[in-house]
């Protein structure tokens, strides 16, 4: 079972990752961002089913198309370098995931844009830090 | 369906320069990252780099750097790369391909490929 | 540099046999691999993307799967086509980089 400090440190974990997720659909959202429209045009893949942190492997999976995506937009609108932001990101997704087991990630049929796929995981933050405060 | 064809084969000296085209044709070059591949006789295969032909932003191995150029020209849907101060272990088939994230998730890997282009550097 | 070692370097089997390729990556890369068939005079082919997925057009008898930092390639029963050089690529972060290749012939 887990214990309340593995359960603390995992939700630290999450409210990084949310935090990070948000950081980036605020700069892609900047209304300064010339880069917009095509950013939009970049396909990214949703999963079926996301209510478990082993279901992080699907967003693990988007983070390259993501890494793409950043190096389209003005670094100003980021702290990071993209290389280094997706880096930091990947990081903690492999933490609360774990490297043990091979999930199979599945896809929906649709596809999303960029703002909708970010939507996505950043409710799914949410959702997981609710069930553990 | 894509293709992408490349020039022909160089025969250069060791010090000079090789500029290596590909062609996209099929679709819009600006819908693909156009990456460059090296395969020495017999060996394995070396990735070079890439650009963006949209926007011209290019990345490129570290081995390459400094004496690597990959540009597009939109215009003919055409990708180059130009390599220069060969020396005899340049001697390879130079690959280009692609990689896209505005279709399916199997093209965002090295789906494409020109029929690749035999330099040989030798004095 | 994420370093990826194929196993074996060669591999000598018969038609209708199983064939199984090893390609082991130095560090962790998630699914961020894809597998690559080549024939002598012929620009590589893709066979499997993102670890286990098979590419369009690609017969049913070649697999990928994954554990850990550990990829495997299998061809459930091979075919005459089927003898050439495999290579492994990672995508997970640049450079990228190949297997140093498996040689499947024909015993």
């Known amino acids: 079972a887990p214990t309340s400090s593995s359960t603390k440190k995992t939700q630290l974990q999450l409210e990084h990752l949310l935090l990070d997720l948000q950081m980036i659909l605020n700069g892609i959202n900047n209304y300064k961002n010339p880069k917009l429209t095509r950013m939009l045009t970049f396909k990214f893949y949703m999963p079926k089913k996301a209510t478990e942190l082993k279901h992080l492997q699907c967003l693990e999976e988007e983070l390259g198309p993501l890494e793409e995506v950043l190096n389209l937009a003005q670094s100003k609108n980021f702290h990071l370098r993209p290389r280094d932001l997706i880096s930091n990101i990947r990081v903690i997704v492999l933490e609360l995931k774990g490297s043990e087991t091979t999930f199979m990630c599945e896809y929906a049929d649709e596809t999303a844009t960029i703002v909708e796929f970010l939507n996505r995981w950043i409710t799914f933050c949410q959702s997981i830090i609710s069930t553990l405060t | 369906q894509v293709q992408l064809v490349q020039s022909g084969a160089e025969v250069k000296k060791p010090g000079a320069t090789v500029k290596i085209s590909c062609k996209v044709s099929g679709d819009t070059i600006t819908a693909y990252y156009m990456h460059w591949v090296r395969q020495a006789p017999g060996q394995g295969l070396e990735w070079i780099g890439r650009?963006?032909?949209?926007?011209?932003?290019?990345k490129y191995a570290e081995n390459f750097k400094g004496r690597v150029t990959i540009t597009a020209d939109t215009s003919t849907d055409t990708a180059y790369m130009e390599l220069s101060s060969l020396r005899s272990e340049d001697t390879a088939v130079y690959y280009c391909?692609?990689?896209?994230?505005?279709?399916?998730?199997?093209?965002?890997?090295?789906?494409?490929w020109g029929q690749g282009t035999l330099v040989t550097v030798s004095s | 540099d994420i370093v990826l070692t194929q196993s074996p370097a060669t591999l000598s089997l018969s038609p209708g046999e199983r064939a199984t390729l090893s390609c082991q990556a130095s560090q962790y890369i998630s699914n961020y691999l894809s597998w690559y068939q080549q024939k002598p005079g012929q620009a590589p082919r893709l066979l499997i993307y993102s670890a286990t997925s098979l590419a369009s057009g690609i017969p049913a008898r070649f697999s990928g799967s994954r554990s850990g930092t550990d990829f495997t390639l299998t061809i459930s029963s091979l075919e005459p086509e089927d003898f050439a050089v495999y290579y492994c690529l990672q995508h997970y972060s640049t450079p990228y980089t190949f297997g140093q290749g498996t040689k499947l012939e024909i015993k």
């Open positions: 650009i963006d032909p949209e926007d011209d932003s290019t």
């Open positions: 391909t692609t990689v896209t994230f505005y279709y399916t998730r199997e093209l965002r890997w090295f789906a494409y």
